[in-house]
Interface confidence: low
């Protein structure tokens, strides 16, 4: 059997392609015959299903070649708060020992992350015999779970959460250190494994693995909002908002922005992924009486989707009967 | 229980088409390569084809090369052999055959032999 | 023709001991595992010997393989009525890049 491909390396140049390049292996023990090229959609960090990224406005950033996430909070929070209930200039709010705690754990999070994504190395499968006739399992990251009291995060199953393994596909790669592999998921990562194969492959089975992580690129109008944007009138001064969310977005959406107002001035409502897998839309609650549009914005791991075209809807006023039994 | 089950077969005039499909249950059918297998009437077993794990690698016997395809479709668990260009030598009862565990890697390895079969299907080509 | 070579016909008393041969070549047998199957009338074939000796479980061991050079044998000792069959023997053939099979030995029980 050849010993491990060497310098395995890979770049994305589109939202659904990586390119993927190695050096031969510096023991071919015989002919080097074939390379096997195997790949596998890891799935997110189960944080990021959790974390409520309407709560204090962070906002997922790229920032590391390995395809890791970074959160950042937005330094600028446009839902400003008043200090002590007084007009005047705003200023931030001093931060609760909770605030500071999440923070100081996030922070933990981050660098445990960064670190286990950097030093992750393949621990090969228990040693079995080749007489054992049993299923082979697939090798994988397992997803982290992360223990936290904090405000900011859901306590709720994500469907997609519960994917934690995904196939590994697989293809065959003769004479030649490099390859290119389509048909992936946009802004998305992935490991892939390859595999140096000898004249004795047949016999023997090939190398273990040499691999890399590597993210697709975003593509460009996957976080748009697919369809229409709809409503249906509510009681108490509120209307209902429904939208389909889009269907192969970078990587996963993270929150909703929706825009609305009459003529006088914009409000602005998140929505967080949670709450939009628990009711498929949101409700907009204490609307004076008058004609409103609204717009609406997915927010993906790797940024915003375009806004939808505005919807119309209206808010009836209520009857001097209804007022008087209100 | 591991199932193999095997459809599609029929007659078929000379030159014409046909696509065999092989139904998978009972066990985790992404991890293992798949093979088929005819038999043609009274006559011996002959391997026409093998498709690794994922997909991505495929052989095939040089009487059929050219001619036929395998292919898998991992989420609907199923196998295919498509059948172009059909001589009266193909007639025969076609085995989609499971390949017994495979090294980490998911090469062509026969080591295991193919360990669960399925009960065939009949392909007559004649005129 | 077949690439590996089966006596056509093989046949014993319930009790006997009986062996069936399988001949092949460097490409074959000399470098690769030999599987054996065996066809009941009217059935599909079932995997006797895997890894030129092993059974899978469930094959009782009265069914015993082992490979030598280039030939490969399977052994049925305690012959039953039920062994009646056809049997097949299997390597990968590395310079054909295919898999193939002995011509089947018809297994009669006397």
């Known amino acids: 059997v050849p010993s491990i491909p060497l310098d395995v390396l890979s770049a994305s140049n589109s939202s659904s392609q990586l390119i993927v390049k190695w050096n031969p292996p510096s023991l071919p023990n015989g002919n080097l015959s074939y390379y096997i090229v195997r790949w596998q959609r890891q799935p997110q960090d189960g944080y990021l299903y959790r974390h409520n990224y309407c709560s204090k406005d962070k906002i997922p950033i790229r920032k590391y070649a390995d395809g890791t996430i970074d959160i950042e909070e937005v330094t600028e929070n446009p839902k400003t708060e008043v200090c002590g209930g007084e007009k005047g200039p705003c200023c931030a709010c001093p931060k609760t020992e909770a605030e500071k705690q999440a923070e100081k754990e996030e922070a933990e999070y981050r660098k445990v992350f960064e670190n286990f994504l950097h030093n992750s190395i393949f621990v090969p499968r228990p040693e079995r015999k080749r007489r054992d006739v049993m299923q082979v399992a697939n090798t994988t990251m397992s997803s982290r779970s992360r223990n936290t009291t904090a405000a900011d995060t859901y306590n709720i199953t994500d469907p997609e959460e519960l994917e934690t393994e995904y196939p590994f596909f697989e293809s065959r790669v003769d004479n030649k250190e490099r390859t290119v592999i389509s048909n992936l998921r946009p802004f998305t990562l992935y490991r892939i494994d390859i595999h140096s194969c000898n004249h004795e492959a047949e016999k023997l089975g090939c190398s273990a693995s040499n691999f890399v992580f590597a993210r697709t690129m975003p593509a460009e109008g996957a976080d748009d909002i697919p369809g229409p944007v709809t409503w249906e009138p509510r009681p108490e001064n509120s209307i209902f908002l429904k939208w389909p969310e889009p269907e192969n977005p970078n990587g996963l959406i993270l929150m909703y922005e929706i825009k609305y107002g009459s003529q006088v001035e914009d409000q602005r409502e998140c929505v967080s992924r949670q709450e939009y897998r628990k009711y498929g839309g949101a409700k907009l609650n204490r609307l004076n009486p008058g004609n409103y549009t609204a717009r609406i914005q997915a927010t993906s791991l790797s940024g915003n989707g375009s806004w939808t075209d505005p919807v119309f809807f209206y808010v009836q006023a209520k009857t001097g009967y209804e007022n008087f039994i209100h | 229980e591991v199932q193999l089950l095997e459809s599609g077969g029929g007659l078929v005039q000379p030159g014409g088409s046909l696509r065999l499909s092989c139904a998978a249950s009972?066990?985790?059918?992404?991890?293992?390569?798949m093979s088929w297998v005819r038999q043609a009437p009274g006559k011996g077993l002959e391997w026409v084809s093998w498709i690794s794990s994922g997909g991505g690698s495929t052989y095939y016997a040089d009487s059929v090369k050219g001619r036929f395809t395998i292919s898998r479709d991992n989420s609907k668990n199923t196998l295919y052999l498509q059948m172009n260009s059909l001589r009266a030598e193909d007639t025969a009862v076609y085995y989609c055959?499971?390949?017994?565990?495979?090294?980490?890697?998911?090469?062509?390895?026969?080591?295991?032999?193919?360990?669960?079969w399925g009960q065939g299907t009949l392909v007559t080509v004649s005129s | 023709q077949s690439v590996l070579t089966q006596p056509p016909s093989a046949s014993g008393t319930p009790g006997q001991r009986v062996t069936i041969s399988c001949s092949g070549s460097?490409?074959?047998?000399?470098?690769?595992?030999v599987s054996w199957y065996q066809q009941l009338p009217g059935t599909a074939p079932k995997l006797l010997i895997y890894?030129?000796?092993q059974r899978p479980s469930g094959v009782p061991d009265r069914f015993s393989g082992s490979k030598s050079g280039t030939s490969a044998s399977l052994a049925i000792s305690g012959l039953r009525s039920e062994d009646e069959a056809d049997y097949y023997c299997g390597s990968w053939d590395a310079s054909l890049n295919a898999y193939v099979f002995g011509g089947g030995t018809k297994l009669t029980v006397l």
């Open positions: 890894d030129n000796s």
């Open positions: 055959a499971k390949l017994g565990s495979l090294f980490p890697n998911a090469t062509a390895s026969y080591a295991y032999g193919m360990d669960v």
């Open positions: 009972g066990f985790t059918f992404s991890n293992y390569a």
């Open positions: 460097s490409s074959n047998i000399g470098s690769n595992d």
